[in-house]
Interface confidence: low
């Protein structure tokens, strides 16, 4: 159904517009494939307006449809590094609450050293997004090569 | 802090919604790695609503957080063309004012012939975005293969 | 020209915000390069709010500038599958009405198995978007690997 038949006026706050852009803080310890993120003006051009970080993972504060985007660049990489013998894959998903756990976006580094994608997905308040990097290759921490963000689009 | 605690009504103009989608005009002369862009209805499906072009570079007119996106396809390219012997890299950054110069987004063509990515970033009125293509390979000018755009997202 | 000099108040409905995110249903029969899409809550995380599906193709219901995005992953693929000898290409375009037929976004799988991109483009009510995958390789139907969506951005 259409999202607003009623013609009510909208205050800015009700538009939502929650938005976050994060930079890589660090990778997880052995056996933890998650990437840990950080954000805030003191760190450069990353920020959180609405969503929050919970132990390096992004937690949503407002229900709605979001545009989720990510770019990850492998740190020590040539076109031969990421071959099918050592598949390196990035997956973005809801990791908690467990009842809503699902993979939202998945990409493999075949003969490339960077993946970048984006998608629209419904998210709910309390959803925590995790980004799992499987394989033996390490991501670059350069802020223009590796970043992760969300943008609230509509209710 | 949250961007609007006050519940004021919003006129359309104040929403900003500055937006631009550009097509490649030409590459720079020797020693100038910048791509020069063009936009406008007469050129096809490119446009500028708010931002302006300054000698082929995109200048921002409204402060805010923007979604910046780009796709560049190399013109004469096979999966072997862009090898480790000839690294071709695309970088999008603020190139003026000099005090705000920074690289926002960077990708290398490893064994691929197209890069595409997007990110959220704060931009200020007067910021000029430059797209630098380093390497010996030329970009395609096909409007469905190479394009660059920004979208105002929120204050 | 600026899109709204008048300072009129905006009801939510007039903001548009038409949005859709689709998952792959099936490929076309021999000689039909189109991908056929599906969407709706019963299918998972795909949805249509405004646009509609017409025989698996996405039809726009509201004039405006849209962000179009897509990711397609090849199903049986290694880094050598899509080689220079055998180009597999994805093109997103307006396929009807015929008078507005145009390619909006095009990418080739060179030595990669996934393409992902996005662009801003003006679309009009009644425009139908088709996604053509040329070549003999089949796309993955995993919902986190292959998806297609649009987001209304502004009038």
């Amino acid at each position: 159904q259409r999202f607003a038949q009623a013609q009510q006026q909208l205050p800015l706050e009700s538009l939502g517009w929650d938005v976050a852009e994060l930079q890589l803080n660090h990778t997880g310890p052995q056996q933890d494939p998650r990437l840990y993120w950080q954000g805030g003006p003191a760190l450069g051009r990353s920020f959180l307006h609405g969503p929050e970080l919970d132990k390096g993972q992004l937690r949503i504060h407002r229900d709605g449809i979001y545009m989720v985007h990510i770019q990850v660049t492998l740190a020590i990489c040539s076109s031969t590094t990421a071959s099918r013998h050592h598949p390196t894959t990035l997956a973005v998903g809801i990791c908690s609450p467990a009842s809503r756990s699902i993979s939202l976006l998945r990409l493999s580094f075949h003969q490339g050293c960077t993946i970048a994608s984006q998608r629209l997905t419904p998210l709910a308040r309390g959803d925590t997004l995790c980004t799992n990097l499987t394989g033996t290759l390490l991501p670059s921490r350069n802020t223009d090569e590796t970043f992760f963000g969300v943008q609230w689009v509509r209710p | 802090q949250r961007f609007a605690q006050a519940q004021q009504q919003l006129p359309l103009e104040s929403l900003g919604w500055d937006v631009a989608e550009l097509q490649l005009n030409h590459t720079g002369p020797q020693q100038d790695p910048r791509l020069y862009w063009q936009g406008g209805p007469a050129l096809g499906r490119s446009f500028l609503h708010g931002p302006e072009l300054d000698k082929g570079q995109l200048r921002i007119h409204r402060d805010g957080i923007y979604m910046v996106h780009i796709q560049v396809t190399l013109a004469i390219c096979s999966s072997t063309t862009a090898s480790r012997h000839h690294p071709t890299t695309l970088a999008v950054g603020i190139c003026s004012p000099a005090s705000r110069s920074i690289s926002l987004l960077r990708l290398s063509f490893h064994q691929g012939c197209t890069i595409a990515s997007q990110r959220l970033t704060p931009l200020a009125r007067g910021d000029t975005l430059c797209t630098n293509l380093t390497g010996t390979l030329l970009p395609s000018r096909n409007t469905d293969e190479t394009f660059f755009g920004v979208q105002w997202v929120r204050p | 020209q600026r899109f709204a000099q008048a300072q009129q108040q905006l009801p939510l409905e007039s903001l548009g915000w038409d949005v859709a995110e689709l998952q792959l249903n099936h490929t076309g029969p021999q000689q039909d390069p189109r991908l056929y899409w599906q969407g709706g809550p019963a299918l998972g995380r795909s949805f249509l709010h405004g646009p509609e599906l017409d025989k698996g193709q996405l039809r726009i219901h509201r004039d405006g500038i849209y962000m179009v995005h897509i990711q397609v992953t090849l199903a049986i693929c290694s880094s050598t599958t899509a080689s220079r000898h055998h180009p597999t290409t994805l093109a997103v375009g307006i396929c009807s009405p015929a008078s507005r037929s145009i390619s909006l976004l095009r990418l080739s799988f060179h030595q990669g198995c996934t393409i992902a991109s996005q662009r801003l483009t003006p679309l009009a009510r009644g425009d139908t978007l088709c996604t053509n995958l040329t070549g003999t390789l089949l796309p993955s139907r995993n919902t986190d690997e292959t998806f297609f969506g649009v987001q209304w951005v502004r009038p």
């Epitope: 040539s78 076109s79 031969t80 590094t81 071959s83 099918r84 013998h85 003969q111 | 090898s83 480790r84 064994q111 | 049986i76 693929c77 290694s78 880094s79 050598t80 599958t81 080689s83 220079r84 000898h85 055998h86 180009p87 030595q111 070549g135 003999t136 390789l137």
Partner: antibody, heavy 122, light 112 residues
């Protein structure tokens, strides 16, 4: 099913020319690179030439470079080998072979024709 | 040009027994993408060659699993775990890394 059928072989005098054809069926010819491979009587295999799916690139063995020309007509699903200035050592069975790249790898000749015999003799 | 050598050039075999053929290249066939561009073909008597192994160790479609390929760089081996009568013929390795592609001289396998 995939089929490659060579034709055009025969007996020819040294210094003369001959054109071989390879008719393809059962697959999308315009998607595949195609090779010519030859085998002299009682000898091993020798790669001769390759042409890209769209004809944009062609490569040759040193032994035939400048004398042989590989070409294709995708509208006719046909591959050609124009052989000029023929020599006795060009005597061989000539096979066309499809490049297997589209089957999931980019090396290997996955389908071969039955071959056509070229005899260069005075 | 890359030169390919094979050994032995002739290999008498007993059905049911294993057999192996060696192939060497004058320079590495390990491509920048991590794959070894070395293929194996079998030419049975009176027939066109048929595809066996690609990229060093990957069996082509329809090839029985008694055939296996191994090796990297410049040294490669084709193994038949249990030879069958239908396996007789000449086995060729080929450099498919760069043009000109070059075949080895072939190894003739026949029943003792």
């Amino acid at each position: 099913q995939v089929q490659l059928v060579e034709s055009g072989g025969g007996v020819v005098q040294p210094g003369r020319s001959l054109r071989l054809s390879c008719a393809a069926s059962g697959f999308t010819f315009s998607n595949y690179g195609i090779h010519w491979v030859r085998q002299a009587p009682g000898k091993g295999l020798e790669w001769v030439a390759v042409i890209w799916y769209d004809g944009s690139n062609k490569y040759y063995a040193d032994s035939v470079k400048g004398r042989f020309t590989i070409s294709r007509d995708n509208s006719k699903n046909t591959l050609y080998l124009q052989m000029n200035s023929l020599r006795a050592e060009d005597t061989a069975v000539y096979y066309c072979a499809r490049d297997g790249g589209y089957s999931g790898y980019d090396s290997g000749f996955d389908y071969w024709g039955q071959g056509t015999l070229v005899t260069v003799s005075s | 040009d890359i030169v390919m050598t094979q050994s032995p050039l002739s290999l008498p075999v007993t059905p049911g027994e294993p057999a192996s053929i060696s192939c060497r290249s004058s320079q590495s066939l390990l491509n920048s993408n991590g794959y070894n561009y070395l293929d194996w073909y079998l030419q049975k008597p009176g027939q066109s060659p048929q595809f066996l192994i690609y990229l060093g160790s990957y069996r082509a479609s329809g090839v029985p699993d008694r055939f296996s390929g191994s090796g990297s760089g410049t040294d490669f081996t084709l193994r038949i775990s249990r030879v069958e009568a239908e396996d007789v013929g000449v086995y060729y390795c080929i450099n498919s890394l760069q043009t000109p592609f070059t075949f080895g001289p072939g190894t003739k396998v026949d029943i003792k």
